[in-house]
């Protein structure tokens, strides 16, 4: 059973995994950021199902690409260089979901744009830390 | 039909530097990411970097970061690439391409004929 | 950066005949997302520019013939040339597209027995 320390530690992760996803979805919607238009062009994956901390697999495989996507946005719109971002939240995604477990993600059919990526996984974080209080 | 046609063959001395240029016709040079690539028959292909010609965005391979600076200038639907402090390692041809589709950053798709640049003395 | 090695570094054929040309990468180019591997294979004859023949490791680029096909998944892909043609002599490139730097095999010199 997790004791109070661990699901404080997971719950801290999840806050620190919520505010990296929310410092990128600002940068991106920043009414100076010329490149939206360009970004939401780009295609990424959901997951069927994301209620789970093993869900985290799904965005842990579409961090890769979300790399890509963010090496588009003037850097000045985010604080770290998008390899430092993605690796902060690749460390994160690691530690949350656990290497233990081989959990096999399965897709939804339909495509994201990078706002509704974005907003998926900041709606799972919101979700499990509000369980986890 | 989309065409990049670049500019010709260029003589240059170890340490000068030089500019070569790319320009887009068929579609709208800010649509797309141009990428430029490196040829020497010895060392095959490598990639330099890309530009984004709507704001001038540019991402270089680490190798390339001192040596290519790449711009754009929307208004003659064209990109430039300026090689600096030019050694013999240099001479090579060098292609502009563009990305196929903007629903990723690659692959190439579209290829200018190429620039062959020789440094010698 | 993924490294790509390609394999053979020439390659002596006839015409008519089948030819195999490999590519490994050190990480898998599989985007589980859509199940596409973004890997892709050039041709580059002597005094040309590259020319895209294969993207995503099996889908032909319009207007390639389809003697070239490309497959494979992962970390280890092939290109398969059936029916060699003259004009097929070149070199050819594989090309991981994934991840910034893109990065190119080797190169493979395709030549006449």
């Known amino acids: 059973a997790p004791t109070s320390s661990s699901t404080k530690k997971t719950q801290l992760q999840l806050e620190h995994l919520l505010l990296d996803l929310q410092m990128i979805l600002n940068g991106i919607n920043n009414y100076k950021n010329p490149k939206l238009t360009r970004m939401l062009t780009f295609k990424f994956y959901m997951p069927k199902k994301a209620t789970e901390l093993k869900h985290l697999q799904c965005l842990e495989e579409e961090l890769k690409p979300l790399e890509e996507v963010l090496n588009l946005a003037q850097s000045k719109n985010f604080h770290l260089r998008p390899r430092d971002l993605i690796s902060n939240i690749n460390v994160i995604v690691l530690e949350l979901k656990g290497s233990e477990t081989t959990f096999m993600c399965e897709y939804a059919d339909e495509t994201a744009t990078i706002v509704e990526f974005l907003n998926r996984w900041i709606t799972f974080c919101q979700s499990i830390i509000s369980t986890l209080t | 039909e989309i065409q990049l046609q670049q500019s010709g063959p260029e003589l240059r001395r170890p340490g000068s530097s030089v500019k070569l240029s790319c320009k887009a016709s068929?579609?709208?040079?800010?649509?797309?990411?141009i990428h430029w690539v490196r040829h020497r028959p010895e060392h095959g292909l490598e990639w330099i970097g890309w530009?984004?010609?709507?704001?001038?965005?540019?991402r270089y391979a680490q190798k390339f970061q001192s040596k290519a600076t790449l711009t754009a200038d929307t208004s003659s639907n064209a990109a430039y690439m300026q090689l600096s402090s030019l050694t013999p390692e240099d001479t090579a041809t060098y292609f502009c391409?563009?990305?196929?589709?903007?629903?990723?950053?690659?692959?190439?798709?579209?290829w200018g004929q190429g620039t062959l640049v020789t440094v010698s003395s | 950066d993924i490294v790509m090695t390609q394999s053979p570094f020439s390659l002596a054929v006839s015409e008519g005949e089948m030819v195999t040309i490999n590519c490994k990468s050190s990480q898998s180019l599989l985007r589980s997302g859509n199940q596409k591997n973004y890997l892709a294979w050039y041709q580059q004859k002597p005094g040309q520019s590259p020319k895209l023949l294969i993207y995503y490791a099996s889908t032909g680029q319009s207007g390639v013939p389809d003697r070239f096909i490309g497959s494979g998944s992962g970390t280890d892909f092939t290109l398969t040339i059936s029916d060699v043609q003259a004009e097929d002599l070149a070199d050819y490139y594989c090309l991981q597209h994934y991840i910034t730097p893109p990065t190119f095999g080797a190169g493979t010199k395709l030549e006449l027995k």
């Open positions: 530009i984004d010609p709507e704001d001038g965005e540019t």
């Open positions: 068929g579609y709208n040079i800010t649509d797309y990411l």
């Open positions: 391409a563009r990305q196929l589709d903007s629903t990723y950053i690659y692959p190439f798709a579209y």
